[in-house]
C-alpha cells in the first residue's frame, strides 16, 4: 500500500461518552492536524474513511454502518452513534485519501457507564465562579449539533443527585444555570440532562461539570509577603544553620503566573558561590488563593554570609513586591569572670 501520513494515536483527545446516549465525534484531522477543512478536502476529491480497533484487540476493522436504525452513521466529518453501546469502546481512525494523498489519525473513544446520581469515571470539566461576584452563569456544554434549532429540548439541571428546584441562589434557565451570588457552598458537580426527540425516538444527553468557587478579582491584591518581615531578626553565629522562609500569599487570579524568588546581594542564588539551597512548597485555600513558601538554607553560615542582603521577591499579575530579611551576627555572650568583672571595677 502507498505511504500514508500517520499522525498516530492522539491520546490528547481522550474522548469519553456515556453509554446509551447519542455521541457525535468529529474527525480530529481537520481540527488539529491539517490546514484545510472537510469541505475543501471533499471538493478536492478526497474521501474520509472510518475504521476502528476494538478494546483489547489489535485488528483494525471497518465500522459497520449497516446496523439497525442506523445506530452508527457518518455525516461529513462526523461519526454518529445513536446511541452508544458499552462495547463501542476502542481506538477509532479517520483516514483522508485519494489516489495520490493519504493522511490518518487515531483517537481513543471510551464509552462510560453512569449511576443514577450521574457518578462515573468521566473526567469532568471545571468551571470557576468568582465568590460573591454577582450573577454568573454556566452553560450546558457540548450539546451543539445534536438537534436542529427547530427542536426545543427539555433541560433538567441537578446538583449532585438532586434536581435543582427552589434553590436559594441557583436558578435553571434552559441551557444556562444562573448563580445569583456564588458561595463556597455552591462547590460541587452540576449535571444538565437534555432530552430531545428524533425520528420518533427520544434521546438524552447528560453533561456533568464541576463548579469551583474561587477568589473574586475585586478582592485580589498584589502578593503579600508574610515572611521575612520587620518583626523577625535572624541572629546567628558563624557555623550555625541559617534558615529564612519567604512566605507569600497570592490572591486567586485567573491565568496568573505566581512567582517567588530570593536574591542574595542582588543576585539569584544560582549566580553566587555560596552553598545555598532553596526548597519550595505550595498550598491552596478553598478559594484557590495560593501560599508559596521558599525556604533559603545555608548549612554553615559564615560571618561574610551574615553581612549579605537576603531579599525575597514575589510577582503576580497584580504586581511585584520584595522584602529584605533582617540578618545579623549574634554578639557572643560576655564571659562573666573576665569582661563583667572588669566592668564592676575588679582588677
Amino acid at each position: 500500500s502507498e505511504r500514508c501520513d500517520d499522525w498516530g494515536l492522539d491520546t490528547m483527545r481522550q474522548i469519553q461518552v456515556f453509554e446509551d446516549e447519542p455521541a457525535r465525534i468529529k474527525c480530529p484531522l481537520f481540527e488539529h492536524f491539517l490546514k484545510f477543512n472537510y469541505s475543501t478536502a471533499h471538493s478536492a476529491g478526497l474521501t474520509l474513511i472510518w475504521y476502528w480497533t476494538r478494546q483489547d484487540r489489535d485488528l483494525e476493522e471497518p465500522i459497520n454502518f449497516r446496523l439497525p436504525e442506523n445506530r452508527i452513521s457518518k455525516e461529513k466529518d462526523v461519526l454518529w452513534f445513536r446511541p452508544t453501546l458499552l462495547n463501542d469502546t476502542g481506538n477509532y481512525t479517520c483516514m483522508l485519501r485519494n489516489t495520490t494523498y493519504c493522511s490518518k489519525v487515531a483517537f481513543p473513544l471510551e464509552v462510560v457507564q453512569k449511576d443514577s446520581c450521574f457518578n462515573s469515571p468521566m473526567k469532568l470539566p471545571v468551571h470557576k465562579l468568582y465568590i460573591e461576584y454577582g450573577i454568573q452563569r454556566i452553560t450546558c456544554p457540548n450539546v451543539d449539533g445534536y438537534f436542529p434549532s427547530s427542536v426545543k429540548p427539555t433541560i433538567t439541571w441537578y446538583m449532585g443527585c438532586y434536581k435543582i428546584q427552589n434553590f436559594n441562589n441557583v436558578i435553571p434557565e434552559g441551557m444556562n444555570l444562573s448563580f445569583l451570588i456564588a458561595l463556597i457552598s455552591n462547590n460541587g458537580n452540576y449535571t444538565c440532562v437534555v432530552t430531545y426527540p428524533e425520528n420518533g425516538r427520544t434521546f438524552h444527553l447528560t453533561r456533568t461539570l464541576t463548579v469551583k468557587v474561587v477568589g473574586s478579582p475585586k478582592n485580589a491584591v498584589p502578593p503579600v509577603i508574610h515572611s521575612p518581615n520587620d518583626h523577625v531578626v535572624y541572629e546567628k553565629e558563624p557555623g550555625e544553620e541559617l534558615l529564612i522562609p519567604c512566605t507569600v500569599y497570592f490572591s486567586f487570579l485567573m491565568d496568573s503566573r505566581n512567582e517567588v524568588w530570593w536574591t542574595i546581594d542582588g543576585k539569584k542564588p544560582d549566580d553566587i558561590t555560596i552553598d545555598v539551597t532553596i526548597n519550595e512548597s505550595i498550598s491552596h485555600s478553598r478559594t484557590e488563593d495560593e501560599t508559596r513558601t521558599q525556604i533559603l538554607s545555608i548549612k554553615k553560615v559564615t560571618s561574610e554570609d551574615l553581612k549579605r542582603s537576603y531579599v525575597c521577591h514575589a510577582r503576580s499579575a497584580k504586581g511585584e513586591v520584595a522584602k529584605a530579611a533582617k540578618v545579623k551576627q549574634k554578639v557572643p555572650a560576655p564571659r562573666y569572670t573576665v569582661e563583667l568583672a572588669c566592668g564592676f571595677g575588679a582588677t
Epitope: 503579600v224 508574610h226 515572611s227 518583626h231 523577625v232 534558615l243 522562609p245 512566605t247 500569599y249 525556604i295
Partner: antibody, heavy 123, light 112 residues
Framework: EVQLVQSGAEVKKPGASVKVSCKAS????????MNWVRQAPGQGLEWVGQ????????YYAQKFQGRVTMTVDTSTSTVYMELSSLRSEDTAVYYC????????????????WGQGTLVTVSS | DIQLTQSPSSLSASVGDRATITCRAS??????????MHWYQQKPGKAPKLLIK???DLESGVPSRFSGSGSGTDFTLTISSVQPEDFATYYC??????????FGQGTKLEIK
C-alpha cells in the same frame, strides 16, 4: 492535616516553674508564628506571647515579661513555653495556637489550636 | 492597649432564632482594606475554634449561617438561624500589630 499536640497536665507549687510543650505537624513548622493563650477556670482568653520558629524571635504580653520564656526545637517541630515564679492566679489551661496567613499583611487570626494543658498552682 | 468590650455577656436564644453579638474596640482596628478582628467559638472543655477572620471572612468548614460585619471600632457576629450545636461561648479577638493580641471577655449563648 494540621495538628498541635500539647504535653499533659501539671501541678506545681507557688514559686516553681512549669514548661509546657506543643508539637506541631501537618504544615511547614518554621514558617508560622506560634502563640500561647491561657484561660483561667471560668474566665476568658488571655494572650501570653508568640514565637517565630525560623528565627526564635519572641514577643510577650507586658503582663508576663520577665516570667515567660518561649523556645523552639525545629528538629522536632516543638515549641515550649516556660513560666516561672508561679502563683495561684497562674492556674489555667494553656493553649498553643498557630497564626494563619491571609491576603492581608498583618492582624493575623489563630486558625489551629492545641488541645490545651491544665497547669494547677497550689500549695 | 486596645480594649475589646463584648455585649451582651450572655444571650438566650431558641433553635431557629437569629443571634447577634457585638464587639467594640477602644480604638480602630481597621486599616486600608481590612479589619483585624476575628471571632471564635468555644465549647466547654474544648479549645476555641476560628469562625470568622478579618471581620467578615468565613473560615473554611464553618457553616454559612455564621457571618461577621463591621469596621473601625464596631463589629458584629451574627448567627442567622441558631442550631443546637451553636450553644457555646463566643470571643472576639483583635491582633492589631505585633506584639499585642487582645480578646473580648466572651458572650455565652444559652438555650432559652
Amino acid at each position: 492535616e494540621v495538628q498541635l499536640v500539647q504535653s499533659g497536665a501539671e501541678v506545681k507549687k507557688p514559686g516553681a516553674s512549669v514548661k509546657v510543650s506543643c508539637k506541631a505537624s501537618g504544615y511547614i513548622f518554621i514558617t508560622y508564628w506560634m502563640n500561647w493563650v491561657r484561660q483561667a477556670p471560668g474566665q476568658g482568653l488571655e494572650w501570653v506571647g508568640q514565637i517565630f520558629p525560623a528565627s526564635g524571635t519572641t514577643y510577650y504580653a507586658q503582663k508576663f515579661q520577665g516570667r515567660v520564656t518561649m523556645t523552639v526545637d525545629t528538629s522536632t517541630s516543638t515549641v515550649y513555653m516556660e513560666l516561672s515564679s508561679l502563683r495561684s492566679e497562674d492556674t489555667a489551661v494553656y493553649y498553643c495556637a498557630r497564626t494563619d496567613f491571609y491576603r492581608y499583611e498583618g492582624g493575623y487570626a489563630l486558625d489551629y489550636w492545641g488541645q490545651g494543658t491544665l497547669v494547677t498552682v497550689s500549695s | 492597649d486596645i480594649q475589646l468590650t463584648q455585649s451582651p455577656s450572655s444571650l438566650s436564644a431558641s433553635v431557629g432564632d437569629r443571634a447577634t453579638i457585638t464587639c467594640r474596640a477602644s480604638q480602630s482596628v481597621s486599616t486600608s482594606g481590612y479589619s483585624s478582628m476575628h471571632w471564635y467559638q468555644q465549647k466547654p472543655g474544648k479549645a476555641p475554634k476560628l469562625l470568622i477572620k478579618y471581620a467578615s471572612d468565613l473560615e473554611s468548614g464553618v457553616p454559612s449561617r455564621f457571618s461577621g460585619s463591621g469596621s473601625g471600632t464596631d463589629f458584629t457576629l451574627t448567627i442567622s438561624s441558631v442550631q443546637p450545636e451553636d450553644f457555646a461561648t463566643y470571643y472576639c479577638h483583635h491582633s492589631w500589630g505585633i506584639p499585642m493580641y487582645t480578646f473580648g471577655q466572651g458572650t455565652k449563648l444559652e438555650i432559652k
